[in-house]
Interface confidence: low
């Protein structure tokens, strides 16, 4: 009764197609699979960025897999062949591991790479990224930004740079068709006559860096002798009402400050008959139903009511 053995996959490699972090892991079937012609061989693939504590694990029948990585760090991967128990009249058989690594050899010292990279997707419409030059670079250094997301044939360079003192310090992106809810990859590299410049890689999803416009058309209406309803409207743009959270700041008679977070475009406030003045501002943010994260908008213009008879007034900004 001979022990069943299987070889690891052949030609296991990590291929960089130039998508700034979206890499291909590919391999060939193991040698000597003739005994298992009737059997569907599977592969267990494990991979991670070097320094990460956990491996991602995939079991597949394919000869390739694609995923995004942080190219600021190295990548390591390993794969072995699995023969399901149906093929071996018993327990599952595993080959030894085939292993491979990939990294982009870093150029220049860390101080030369861009600092404080900040990207904001304004109103889910306009992407703008800005950065500061590395703290160890001269004015002859210039930075270039490249980006890619699934749907583009190849990485594209920024065509509309923001400049200061002749250096590129930001990028205004063109309209980015079908670019949300998927990984968006950026590389900022640089060139200098004096020294090599360290590249930086960034990955995010656009819906998580949205900064909406502030709410508009703030109004007051008296609901009862002791209740006032505050209302506002969502700003123009592509963000649907269901995607907003709001934060309200209310000041009564210049003393009490009330803050509240709500999901709708209204807020009911308890007041007393002694209230002489009421002011409020609102700001908005994309909520957890539409993104994992977001940036608060600027505050709206302040809307105030002063006087005796709130019941006769509905104030529009």
């Amino acid at each position: 009764d001979t022990e069943i053995k299987v070889n690891p996959p052949q030609d296991f490699e990590i291929v960089d197609p130039g998508y700034l972090g979206y890499l291909y892991l590919q391999w060939q079937p193991p040698l000597s699979l003739d005994h298992f012609k009737e059997c569907t061989v599977e592969y267990e693939l494990k991979y991670r960025n070097i320094g990460s504590e956990t491996w991602k694990t995939i079991i597949t029948k394919n000869l390739h897999y694609k995923d995004g990585f942080d190219l600021n760090k190295g990548i390591e991967a390993k794969i072995h062949t699995l023969l399901p128990w149906q093929c071996t009249n018993g327990s599952e058989v595993q080959s030894s591991w085939a292993e491979t690594t990939y990294w982009i050899s870093p150029q220049g010292i860390p101080e030369t790479k861009v600092q404080d990279m900040d990207c904001v997707y304004y109103n889910w419409q306009y992407l703008l990224c800005s950065w500061k030059p590395g703290i160890g670079v001269l004015l002859d250094t210039n930075y270039n930004l490249f980006y890619w997301y699934e749907g583009l044939d190849h990485a594209l360079q920024c065509v509309d740079y923001i400049k200061a003192d002749g250096q590129n310090i930001g990028c205004r992106f063109p309209y980015l068709e079908a670019s949300d809810y998927k990984d968006f990859y950026i590389c900022v590299n640089g060139s200098s006559e004096n020294k090599p410049i360290r590249s930086s890689y960034f990955t995010f999803q656009l819906q998580n860096i949205v900064k909406p416009l502030p709410p508009v058309y703030l109004t007051f209406t008296r609901e009862s002798s002791c209740e006032i309803k505050l209302k506002w409207s969502i700003p123009l743009g592509p963000i649907p009402a269901r995607c907003f959270d709001y934060e309200i700041e209310i000041r009564e008679d210049d003393t009490t400050l009330v803050t509240a977070t709500v999901e709708n475009e209204t807020y009911t406030l308890k007041t007393t008959n002694e209230t002489r003045q009421l002011c409020f501002v609102v700001r908005s943010k994309v909520n957890i139903y539409c993104s994992d994260d977001g940036i608060w908008s600027e505050w709206s213009d302040k809307q105030c009511w002063e006087g005796e008879d709130l019941s006769k007034k509905t104030l529009l900004r």
Epitope: G74, E111, G136, L138
Partner: antibody, heavy 119, light 111 residues
Amino acid sequence: QVQLVQSGAEVVKPGASVKVSCKASGYTFTNYWMNWVRQAPGQGLEWIGRIDAYAGETHYNQKFKDRVTMTVDTSTSTVYMELSSLRSEDTAVYYCARGYGDAYGMDHWGQGTLVTVSS
Amino acid sequence: DIQMTQSPSSLSASVGDRVTITCRASESVDNYGISFMNWFQQKPGKAPKLLIYAASRQGSGDPSRFSGSGSGTDFTLTISSLQPEDFATYFCQQSKEVPWTFGQGTKVEIK
């Protein structure tokens, strides 16, 4: 939190070698350099060299260049410093210290390893 | 090698005093618009602790009473109001050129 844990004290004979380890945790190991600094009893600080935990590149103080070897094991997040042809004046506390880049300083240090060279 | 000279080598001060330690490099430690100068605090039997990097930037979690200044060859560490836990030895260090070099240290003692 960031921790650098060094191997224990060593007593070695003149002419021998010593290998000190520094195990890092609490941060992305390969993003940083590891420096080695020594301090003889009652004396100041002396920089021995550093190793890039990502690429294994080393920069040594010329004073130690022929006697020091720094290595890195990324699988265990450990850096090693080996000093050979030891003499009595190498008796010192040896520290590992993390650094991001030249301008950022050495922001976390190991607890130190006392190496005593004595016959 | 760049030589680092600290002064004074020791000083006595009282809690609440303003303390200034100076460090002079044998050549400029400025490069690319930044000063590659760091300051460390060391207490007996302990590892050094980074206080200031790039001449004036505070290390993480360090009290604001520690500040650094200077450029080129002359640098200063200032403790605005000395606290009991500040009695220690202070070292300057340049990281512009390998080998990185330290000052000989300034011991701050209780008066």
